[in-house]
Amino acid sequence: VSITKCNSDMNGYCLHGQCIYLVDMSQNYCRCEVGYTGVRCEHFYL
């Protein structure tokens, strides 16, 4: 799978994580920080 950094317009897309662009799948993906979940890393869990 080809990946690259997200475009600058997606700054802030991932609330608590790193935004990765999955080129072949035509979509952005959030790699969440520890303790966060959700499509955009918006949920905190203990």
Epitope: N7, S8, G12, Y13, E42
Partner: antibody, heavy 116, light 106 residues
């Protein structure tokens, strides 16, 4: 199956406002950005602006900044685009477009006609 | 705002010809360019994103290339069903469409 269903065609008088809705099904708009694009008859595509429904943040093309308002109601999974002070040049098909989780998934378009 | 200058605005070619359309951005868009095909009365159809990644179901005669500010869209062998208007779109910093290229059969 993911869908963006837009409201029906509108006819408006110059100076009036129009509000176009875009209802999402099959996905949560909070996971995406919703863009708005328009196309006047026989003309090219023109990006108007977008909303991040999760945060409520909006960005607009400079030429529309004073006249357009993009909103989202996450409880009904619906985005809206309101354009005020309509003039004849605003006659166009208006599209909502999902981006973020999937690159550019388009609604069917809404024709807005501005005529006296 | 980033400006996208697309050329030519129209072209006429024969079936089987190679067709090339270019888009020049006013600043580096880091390969974040997509290409759309639009036929009359239809919504635009995404052909290519991230400069050269073909969407599923799109024929391999369509291709894209480029980097920095200069990008190219190519139809290697024009077919009658390719008659349409083609648009580039930069999506690095917000979004801007090129002016479009109307492709006709000679």
């Amino acid at each position: 199956q993911d869908q963006l269903v837009q409201s029906g065609a509108e006819v408006k008088k110059p100076g009036a406002s129009v509000k176009v809705s875009c209802k999402a099904s099959g996905f949560n708009i909070k996971d995406t950005y919703i863009q708005w694009v328009r196309q006047a008859p026989g003309q090219g595509l023109e990006w108007m602006g977008r909303i991040d429904p999760l945060r409520g943040n909006t960005k607009y093309r400079e030429k529309f900044e004073r006249r357009v308002t993009i909103t989202a109601d996450t409880s009904t999974n619906t985005a809206y685009m309101e354009l005020s002070s309509l003039r004849s040049e605003d006659t166009a098909v208006y599209y909502c477009v999902r981006s973020g989780t999937l690159f550019d998934f388009w609604g069917q378009g809404t024709l807005v006609t501005v005529s006296s | 705002d980033i400006q996208m200058t697309q050329s030519p605005s129209s072209l006429s070619a024969s079936v089987g010809d190679r067709v090339t359309i270019t888009c020049k951005a006013s600043q580096d868009i880091h390969k974040y360019i997509a290409w759309y095909q639009q036929k009359p009365g239809q919504a635009p159809r995404l052909l290519i994103q991230y400069t050269s990644t073909l969407q599923p179901g799109v024929p391999s005669r369509f291709s894209g290339s480029g980097s920095g500010t200069d990008y190219t869209f190519t139809i290697s062998s024009l077919q009658p069903e390719d008659i349409a208007t083609y648009y580039c779109l930069q999506y690095d910093n917000l979004r801007t469409f090129g002016g479009g290229t109307k492709v006709e059969i000679k």
